[in-house]
């Protein structure tokens, strides 16, 4: 089939990095600068992506593959193939339309990106809070008070009135 196709269509012989030039009797011409073709048999070359401004070049464009970008320090990639760069925030913050804002009480973010997430509610799993949550860290749940045999642990269960580390309901 491939042999038959190549007899019918001279363009199918053009390898990656070239295009089938209709202006030159369908001969295979190299892709011009700033363009590429990643597959054979193409009638045009695609324009190389330009990693400029907030974007940095991670991989240069070649005649057979597109450039790849990442983001300048202080920003991180979003979207397929790093199509956008979003501002980093500090741990304990999330990015809003008004910029980086601290996580509300009862939530945390341990990364420079993404949103603040509620602390784990230890009591839902029948456990108690071993280490309190902060804006940067989730609570650490420990065994439930009933599981603790006398002298097995020095952790004092929190007062039942308000258990630190619960998400606000």
């Amino acid at each position: 089939f491939e042999r038959t196709r190549s007899l019918q269509d001279p363009c199918s012989n053009c390898p990656a990095g070239t295009f089938c030039d209709n202006n030159r009797n369908q001969i295979c011409s190299p892709c011009p600068p700033n363009s590429f073709s990643s597959a054979g048999g193409q009638r045009t070359c695609d324009i190389c992506r330009q990693c400029k401004g907030v974007f940095r070049t991670r991989k240069e464009c070649s005649s057979t593959s597109n450039a790849e970008c990442d983001c300048t320090p202080g920003f991180h990639c979003l979207g397929a193939g790093c199509s956008m760069c979003e501002q980093d925030c500090k741990q304990g913050q999330e990015l809003t339309k008004k910029g980086c804002k601290d996580c509300c009480f009862g939530t945390f973010n341990d990364q420079k990106r993404g949103i603040c997430r509620p602390w784990t509610n230890c009591s839902l799993d029948g456990k108690s809070v071993l280490v309190n949550g902060t804006k940067e860290r989730d609570v650490v749940c420990g065994p439930s008070p009933a599981d603790l045999s006398p002298g097995a642990s020095s952790v004092t269960p929190p007062a039942p009135a308000r258990e630190p580390g619960h998400s606000p309901q």
Epitope: N34, R49, G53, G74, Q87
Partner: antibody, heavy 121, light 110 residues
Framework: QVQLQESGPGLVKPSETLSLTCTVS????????WTWIRQPPGKCLELVGY???????SYNPSLKSRVTISIDTSKNQFSLQLNSVTAADTAVYFC???????????????WGQGTTVTVSS | QSVLTQPPSASGTPGQRVTISCSGS????????VNWYRQLPGTAPKLLIY???QRPSGVPDRFSGSKSGTSASLAISGLQSEDEADYYC???????????FGCGTKLTVL
């Protein structure tokens, strides 16, 4: 179709601050660069600076000490402030969209109509 | 003084082909694609050619662009009276981290 509209005073006194706002309509301000370009009477186009939707900025080195560009994605607006203006800052100021560097290739492809700013006492 | 150099004027008669040149350096045209803009009096520039030789939809194929080394050129064939305008080249400049422009070429159709 995306449209851009500049707004701000047409007359600014020497040594004062030039403030312009560009409102983006018909599309999102996200994932593009937003640019200010100026054209003094009978002279060349000059990039003032640009801001990426997520806050990255870059300014023309010759203006860097006097210029600030900011963005408000909730209002679909971006703004230019140029301090300590002189008569040499008299120009038509264009706001423009630039999709260069993401997955776009066009560069500065959408322009506002331009607003004339005169620096005079 | 502009970073990209263009002739201040060019002219031709209807039906003719005219070429406008744009010269730069390795930090702009030499390393990056070139755009061309057309500006009518009292209006904003309009994108005519992007990425050296690509036409946005709506731009007739009478307009073509090319680039070699640190120079670029815009060719207009079948010149028409409505082509009378200012034409600007632009390229990203790596050392400035931004766009640089030519000072424009005023095209007159005789």
């Amino acid at each position: 179709q995306v449209q851009l509209q500049e707004s701000g005073p047409g007359l600014v006194k020497p040594s004062e601050t030039l403030s312009l706002t560009c409102t983006v309509s018909g599309g999102s301000i996200s994932s593009y660069y937003w640019t200010w370009i100026r054209q003094p009477p009978g002279k060349c186009l000059e990039l003032v600076g640009y801001i990426y939707y997520s806050g990255y900025t870059s300014y023309n080195p010759s203006l860097k000490s006097r210029v600030t560009i900011s963005i408000d994605t909730s209002k679909n607006q971006f703004s230019l402030q140029l301090n300590s203006v002189t008569a040499a800052d008299t120009a038509v100021y264009f706001c423009a969209r630039d999709d260069y560097g993401g997955n776009g290739y066009y560069g500065v492809d959408v322009w506002g109509q331009g607003t004339t700013v005169t620096v005079s006492s | 003084q502009s970073v990209l150099t263009q002739p201040p004027s060019a002219s031709g008669t209807p039906g003719q082909r005219v070429t406008i040149s744009c010269s730069g350096s390795s930090s702009n045209i030499g390393n990056n694609p070139v755009n061309w803009y057309r500006q009518l009096p009292g209006t904003a520039p309009k994108l005519l050619i992007y990425s050296n030789n690509q036409r946005p939809s709506g731009v007739p194929d009478r307009f073509s662009g090319s680039k070699s080394g640190t120079s670029a050129s815009l060719a207009i064939s079948g010149l028409q009276s409505e082509d009378e305008a200012d034409y600007y080249c632009a390229a990203w400049d790596d050392s400035l981290n931004g766009w640089v422009f030519g000072c424009g070429t005023k095209l007159t159709v005789l």
